[in-house]
């Protein structure tokens, strides 16, 4: 089949923009650390890079292959407020490179970590 | 309490970077439109802007207040392959402005649309 060059160019552009790579995301700190429901952070979210985007097949998953750590200071507030905000220092995993990996490999990796 | 200026500056920066605003995201086309499991798109994902980020309170939700529509041409593949990829033109919602809205208001809004 012969396809319009414009269509092919725009499709190629979409592939590039949606590929598996580190992307700036907002992380909800409370959810990330699963803290008690009366513990809040200000700001509630931080910006870090995490692997994201799409892989070319259903059986693949976008996973980090290398990670750096970013240190950020936030305020922690516990309610009822018996004292003011307390500073907490958090080291956030920041994905620096990513790869589309087989979901089976990812599953094996996780389970070998558990079994180790 | 007296806090270090550097800490306050970095916290302010985090607030700005994580605020509720349109953000470039990857949308899985098949999931977005809930197509049949034997229908695939190439590329499987497209890049659009959707509201995201954090609001200052648990009771608020980052919601779109205006939307434009982007037309994108992709290839649709149906298996078993009786024919080659077919170009399809899909219109995607692209959020152009956002606001932190009360979850109650969002709920009311959704339910008033349903009831109409």
């Amino acid at each position: 089949a012969h396809y319009n060059t414009e269509i092919l160019k725009s499709i190629d552009n979409e592939w590039r923009k949606t590929q598996c790579m580190p992307r700036e995301v907002c992380i909800d700190v409370g959810k990330e650390f699963g803290v008690a429901t009366n513990t809040f952070f200000k700001p509630p979210c931080v910006s870090v890079y995490r692997c994201g985007g799409c892989c070319n097949s259903e059986g693949l998953q976008c996973m980090n292959t290398s990670t750096s750590y970013l240190s950020k200071t936030l305020f922690e507030i516990t309610v009822p407020l018996s004292q003011g905000p307390k500073p907490v220092t958090i080291s956030f995993a920041n994905h620096t490179s990513c790869r589309c990996m087989s979901k089976l490999d990812v599953y094996r990796q996780v389970h070998s970590i558990i079994r180790r | 309490a007296h806090y270090n200026t550097e800490i306050l500056k970095s916290i302010d920066n985090e607030w700005r970077k994580t605020q509720c605003m349109p953000r470039e995201v990857c949308i899985d086309v098949g999931k977005e439109f809930g197509v049949a499991t034997n229908t695939f798109f190439k590329p499987p994902c497209v890049s659009v802007y959707r509201c995201g980020g954090c609001c200052n309170s648990e009771g608020l939700q980052c919601m779109n207040t205006s939307t434009s529509y982007l037309s994108k041409t992709l290839f649709e593949i149906t298996v078993p392959l009786s024919q080659g990829p077919k170009p399809v033109t899909i219109s995607f919602a692209n959020h152009t402005s956002c606001r932190c809205m009360s979850k109650l208001d969002v709920y009311r809004q959704v339910h008033s649309i349903i009831r109409r």
Epitope: G34, A36, Y69, S91, A93, I114 | -
Partner: nanobody
Framework: EVQLVESGGGLVQPGGSLRLSCAAS????????MGWYRQAPGKQRELVAA???????LYADSVKGRFTISRDNSKNTLYLQMNSLRAEDTAVYYC????????????WGQGTQVTVSS
Amino acid sequence: EVQLVESGGGLVQPGGSLRLSCAASGSMFSMYAMGWYRQAPGKQRELVAATTSGGSTLYADSVKGRFTISRDNSKNTLYLQMNSLRAEDTAVYYCYTYWRGSDPENYWGQGTQVTVSS
């Protein structure tokens, strides 16, 4: 259902060290976010340290540089190494875990007493 059992608390002199352990039952341990809270008599429970499955760590500024959180996924155990202990670290230390499934939930241990006194 996840069960958590803390151990390692006790009486220690100021400047001393203790290592708290939190053993978890259940599978998928490495996928949990986990951490430690403490509660001193008449005070509110406060967050001490936490860690995620992705390797992020959190420390309250009052313990930063003195306490270290770590986990051994092969033993399903979370640790809190506490050095240079002070009288103000006296509290009951609680381990928690957070399962981020379809129904997110916190699970808590029964606590272990740490007393710092000369």
